[in-house]
């Protein structure tokens, strides 16, 4: 079967600027090492938000300073992006690469539009 990556079309970040979504992939082979990358597309510019490589059956770990966290279960990755502000609203694309064993495969999702609304500042109380 073909490598296919599915992710939700739209997600709304919560009031603390945290957004979560599932990135699910159909695997054409029995990969033991998988790399998941979150990309942000604004206009035609694409930037990497975060990336993690994990061994199947193990947890995926992002770098300590990453704004992403996540858990994996089979061919499903639950991604959470933190610290988002209104200016970070955009299309977040999930890319999955089957790194080992060869052959290498790559799949890319259609993207999740994440909407972020900055919370209203609390009014001063007298």
């Amino acid at each position: 079967k073909a490598m296919h990556v599915a992710q939700p079309a739209v997600v709304l970040a919560n009031s603390r600027g945290t957004a979560s979504f599932v990135c699910e992939y159909a695997s054409p082979g029995k990969a033991t090492e998988v790399r998941v990358t979150v990309l942000r597309q604004a206009d035609s510019q694409v930037t990497e938000v975060c990336a993690a490589t994990y061994m199947m059956g193990n947890e995926l770990t992002f770098l300590d300073d990453s704004i992403c966290t996540g858990t994996s279960s089979g061919n499903q990755v639950n991604l959470t992006i933190q610290g988002l502000r209104a200016m970070d609203t955009g299309l977040y694309i999930c890319k999955v690469e089957l790194m080992y064993p060869p052959p290498y495969y790559m799949g890319i999702g259609n993207g999740t539009q994440i909407y972020v609304i900055d919370p209203e500042p609390c009014p001063d109380s007298d």
Epitope: A2, M3, L39, V46, K95, Y100, P103, Y104, M106, I108
Partner: antibody, heavy 120, light 107 residues
Framework: QVQLVESGGGVVQPGRSLILSCAAS????????MHWVRQAPGKGLEWVAV????????YYADSVKGRFTISRDNSKNTLYLQMSSLRAEDTAVYYC?????????????WGQGSLVTVSS | DIQMTQSPSSLSASVGDRVAITCRTS??????LNWYQQKPGKAPELLIY???SFQSGVPSRFRGSGSGTDFTLTISSLQPEDFATYYC?????????FGPGTKVDIK
């Protein structure tokens, strides 16, 4: 601007070895995967090998597996292809190419090529 | 390995003509197909790449379409500098493979 300059090609006898180099400039070399692609005289394009940006992963075409080794030196901004047990069918122009950041298996920029002729 | 076929293998056309080149893959590659242009004695140049939403700077007369196993490169109005050989290539899986090429020459 992006520049890729191959060197090391030439005439070599079957069974012998050769090392090709590709000097890169105009971009952050250590951020990109790099490929070798070859083209036999009058023929089409054939992908040879790729090395990941940090050297962590390498993949090869079946036709060269076990005979060719791709490597890189990020401190020198240089890509290498070590070719051993060369055969007549390895005769080709060898191009180095920069991969894409989003799509590694893409050839965004190409060098001018280096001709390798395997002949007795 | 993913096999690639291209048709036609060659075609003759005139400046201003609309030209279509098709590429077919032996299995689904989603939309991970790229097109290159090569002129005699020169290195290939990336023309159109996938996913198309990541693309910028492509002359508007060139358009890539398709998904799965069937893809098309269309040149809406052929210019003198477009006479060259065109290759499709999949970036879905190793080994990364090319089509055999389509040579576009002057009628």
């Amino acid at each position: 601007q992006v520049q890729l300059v191959e060197s090391g090609g030439g005439v070599v006898q079957p069974g012998r070895s050769l090392i090709l180099s590709c000097a890169a400039s105009g971009f952050t070399f250590s951020s990109y995967g790099m490929h070798w692609v070859r083209q036999a005289p009058g023929k089409g394009l054939e992908w040879v090998a790729v090395v990941w940006y940090d050297g962590s992963n390498k993949y090869y075409a079946d036709s060269v597996k076990g005979r060719f080794t791709i490597s890189r030196d990020n401190s020198k901004n240089t890509l290498y292809l070590q070719m051993s047990s060369l055969r007549a069918e390895d005769t080709a122009v060898y191009y180095c190419a920069r991969g894409g950041i989003v799509v590694p298996g893409l050839f965004e920029y190409w060098g001018q090529g280096s001709l390798v002729t395997v002949s007795s | 390995d993913i096999q690639m076929t291209q048709s036609p293998s060659s075609l003759s056309a005139s400046v201003g003509d609309r030209v279509a080149i098709t590429c077919r893959t032996s299995q689904s590659i989603s939309n991970l197909l790229n097109w290159y242009q090569q002129k005699p004695g020169k290195a290939p140049e990336l023309l159109i790449y996938a996913p198309s939403s990541f693309q910028s700077g492509v002359p508007s007369r060139f358009r890539g379409s398709g998904s799965g196993t069937d893809f098309t490169l269309t040149i809406s109005s052929l210019q003198p500098e477009d006479f060259a050989t065109y290759y499709c290539q999949q970036s879905y899986s190793t080994p990364f493979t090319f089509g055999p090429g389509t040579k576009v020459d002057i009628k």
